[in-house]
């Protein structure tokens, strides 16, 4: 559980998190889990304002999602 402080090197991106390809990184408990266990934000309608640039551990976009919408948490080696 996330009871203690987290450490980031200044404002740098964190070190890569080694999730196997079928897994995604759960940001809330900080470990790799099956991607299907995580739920991304609701799809935005086409034409909605584009989201902020993705960070290393944000969900990635996929074909079939609404314009610029995150579809799945980023799997594999992050």
């Amino acid at each position: 559980m996330r009871r203690g402080p987290r450490s980031l090197r200044g404002r740098d991106a964190p070190a890569p998190t080694p999730c196997v390809p079928a897994e995604c990184f759960d940001l809330l408990v900080r470990h790799c889990v099956a991607c299907g266990l995580l739920r991304t934000p609701r799809p935005k309608p086409a034409g909605a304002s584009s989201p902020a640039p993705r960070t290393a551990l944000q969900p990635q976009e996929s074909v079939g999602a609404g314009a610029g919408e995150a579809a799945l948490p980023l799997p594999g080696l992050l």
């Epitope: 991106a13 995580l38 739920r39």
Partner: antibody, heavy 117, light 111 residues
Framework: EVQLVESGGGLVQPGGSLRLSCAAS????????WNWVRQAPGKGLEWVGY???????YYNPSLKSRFTISRDTSKNTLYLQMNSLRAEDTAVYYC???????????WGQGTLVTVSS | DIQMTQSPSSLSASVGDRVTITCRAS??????????MHWYQQKPGKAPKLLIY???DLESGVPSRFSGSGSGTDFTLTISSLQPEDFATYYC?????????FGQGTKVEIK
């Protein structure tokens, strides 16, 4: 579209127990984070705790000893067992589903629990 | 626990006004380059409604007059042009660390 329906609220005497239910449809409770949030009359929101996809629970430390969150995956239903109830537990209790970032984007309508003699 | 402090606690405004609500966390709610800060709107007798997640991302279906900004410990919710349906109470919430915590709320009333 996720839909959440709470039930089980009502009047209970101090020291009593109550179990609230939250029936989910539109998604499996074995995905994501399923929360209970409460709101005392005229007050703000207070997070009670969550149960996640793996069945792991985490609670507001001020409530942990008296409140227990559980689930029945066969019924796709979330529960909040409340013991040793006090007058200050009087509140509307909401269940809410949180996304990848912990933002609660689906909420039930709430169920009122009144603790009074 | 991370304490969330909203200001003001209440405000009076008119339709068309630009409204700004601030939320300060007792420690940073940033991690992985993400701000784990969210904003909700609640009307009397109704469940809260998510407006903004991850500090600045507009929830699906929420009007574009709502926007969020900030990072670290200081965050802002802005309503660019207040509409009659926007009179409500607004809450910030952090999910950076357990236990998740809410601000005390800001009530936006009609002037």
């Amino acid at each position: 579209e996720v839909q959440l329906v709470e039930s089980g609220g009502g009047l209970v005497q101090p020291g009593g127990s109550l179990r609230l239910s939250c029936a989910a449809s539109g998604d499996s409770i074995t995905r994501g984070y399923w929360n209970w949030v409460r709101q005392a009359p005229g007050k703000g929101l207070e997070w009670v705790g969550y149960i996640n996809y793996s069945g792991t629970t985490y609670y507001n430390p001020s409530l942990k000893s008296r409140f227990t969150i559980s689930r029945d995956t066969s019924k796709n239903t979330l529960y909040l067992q409340m013991n040793s109830l006090r007058a200050e537990d009087t509140a509307v209790y909401y269940c809410a589903n949180a996304n990848y970032y912990g933002a609660m984007d689906y909420w039930g309508q709430g169920t009122l629990v009144t603790v009074s003699s | 626990d991370i304490q969330m402090t909203q200001s003001p606690s209440s405000l009076s405004a008119s339709v068309g006004d630009r409204v700004t609500i601030t939320c300060r966390a007792s420690e940073s709610v940033d991690d992985y380059g993400i701000s784990f800060m969210h904003w909700y709107q609640q009307k009397p007798g109704k469940a809260p409604k998510l407006l903004i997640y991850r500090a600045s991302d507009l929830e699906s279906g929420v009007p574009s007059r709502f926007s969020g900004s900030g990072s670290g410990t200081d965050f802002t919710l802005t309503i660019s042009s207040l509409q009659p349906e926007d009179f409500a109470t607004y809450y910030c919430q952090q999910t950076s660390k357990d236990p998740w915590t809410f601000g005390q709320g800001t009530k936006v009333e009609i002037k």
